[in-house]
Amino acid sequence: SAHAHPRDSCPLGPGRCCHLETVQATLEDLGWSDWVLSPRQLQLSMCVGECPHLYRSANTHAQIKARLHGLQPDKVPAPCCVPSSYTPVVLMHRTDSGVSLQTYDDLVARGCHCA
Amino acid sequence: SAHAHPRDSCPLGPGRCCHLETVQATLEDLGWSDWVLSPRQLQLSMCVGECPHLYRSANTHAQIKARLHGLQPDKVPAPCCVPSSYTPVVLMHRTDSGVSLQTYDDLVARGCHCA
């Protein structure tokens, strides 16, 4: 198959490779305080860390990218750490007609990979 | 809505922001010459370039990431340029039972965004 085996152990040392990390943010940080009422603080899971060769490759394209980056680092960037899935979050916010609860499916990362 | 308007004009100058670029690669480059027979050369579209604030944001999460990167650049990375969609590619390759044509859906990028 076109898939080499993606690596799951980090060759750079603990916590250095692509992983999920929690970042605390207030509505003010996000610039949402004028329209979101609740929650006032968000625990935002984000994808951080490096993507060494074949670490958590998202797909065949990411494996190719990793290989070509090794050959042409100035021309082809290394894969980077982005969400592979998301966790839904419900926000309470102002609308034209009052106040509403709405679920956002693409706000908080649940998993990460190298793409 | 949680979506600020993603920017589509590059503030860094032409060709600097996240875009699709063609990279020529041989089967040797990819390490595939022992099992792929054709094509011998691939025109690989890849996503390259920077992701300045709100440029081609993939979703709400990417917009949040851009904003928090501005506030905490050491803790939160900037969004990065990754494929938003792929173009299928047919490879002719050796199998245990002979030669086969197989479609790969995740090999060549068709569009890019900042995630």
């Epitope: 009422l37 929650p39 968000l42 935002l44 509403s100 609860l101 679920t103 | -």
Partner: antibody
């Protein structure tokens, strides 16, 4: 520890108003919103509305719109629910509850002991 | 409004029994569902939130599952203090709505 203490039982005549208080302690009042829920004798739970303790924004159940007003006083960490033009079917135990809302979702984690409001001529 | 339908409306069980209560939403509510326990003359007590997260201090014999429209509360081994009425509640959209309740009685 977190506590919500409600005002005492009330007996009201039809057409009158009632104002129930809910005094919070053991946490930062403005950091958590308050909901009100009522329960008629032998019946289930009915959500009445939500108030933001920080901004004062409110959401009311449609059937109570125009008769109910929810307010907060952050200086005394107290929430109030006033119901006007009382009818016999407003006879119920009225509860306040603290809203916990984060990225895991919404839940009502601490409740007052309840206030019985009886509407009778 | 989202209607929440609980079943059964009552169940007779013995100490040690496994009890399952179901709750169905009239439209999809993701995982935005909570379960509460209420004893006579007392305020409701939160057991489960976000469909399956156990509230702090609640015994692990209580568990919740489901997403979308169908949800379940399970008491793995009924204890004497578990005889009460249980309510599901959706917090997906306003107005917030409760199920009609399930009374767990001693057999």
């Amino acid at each position: 520890q977190v506590q919500l203490v409600q005002s005492g039982a009330e007996v009201k005549k039809p057409g009158a108003s009632v104002k129930v208080s809910c005094k919070a302690s053991g946490y930062t009042f403005a950091s958590y919103d308050i909901i009100w829920v009522r329960q008629a004798p032998g019946q289930g739970l009915e959500w009445m509305g939500w108030i933001s303790a920080l901004s004062g924004d409110t959401v009311y159940a449609q059937k109570l719109q125009g008769r109910v007003t929810m307010t907060t006083d952050t200086s005394t960490s107290t929430a109030y629910m006033e119901l006007r033009s009382l009818r016999s079917d407003d006879t119920a135990v009225y509860y306040c509850a603290r809203t916990r809302h984060d990225t895991s979702g919404i839940r009502f984690d601490y409740w007052g002991q309840g206030t019985l409001v009886t509407v009778s001529s | 409004d989202i209607q929440m339908t609980q079943s059964p409306s009552s169940v007779s069980a013995s100490v040690g029994d496994r009890v399952t209560i179901t709750c169905r939403a009239s439209q999809g509510i993701d995982s935005w569902l909570a379960w509460y326990q209420q004893k006579p003359g007392k305020a409701p007590k939160l057991l489960i939130y976000a469909a399956s997260s156990l509230q702090s201090g609640v015994p692990s014999r209580f568990s919740g599952s489901g997403s979308g429209t169908d949800f379940t509360l399970t008491i793995s081994s009924l204890q004497p203090e578990d005889f009460a009425t249980y309510y599901c509640q959706q917090v997906h959209s306003f107005p917030i709505t409760f199920g009609g309740g399930t009374k767990v009685e001693i057999k």
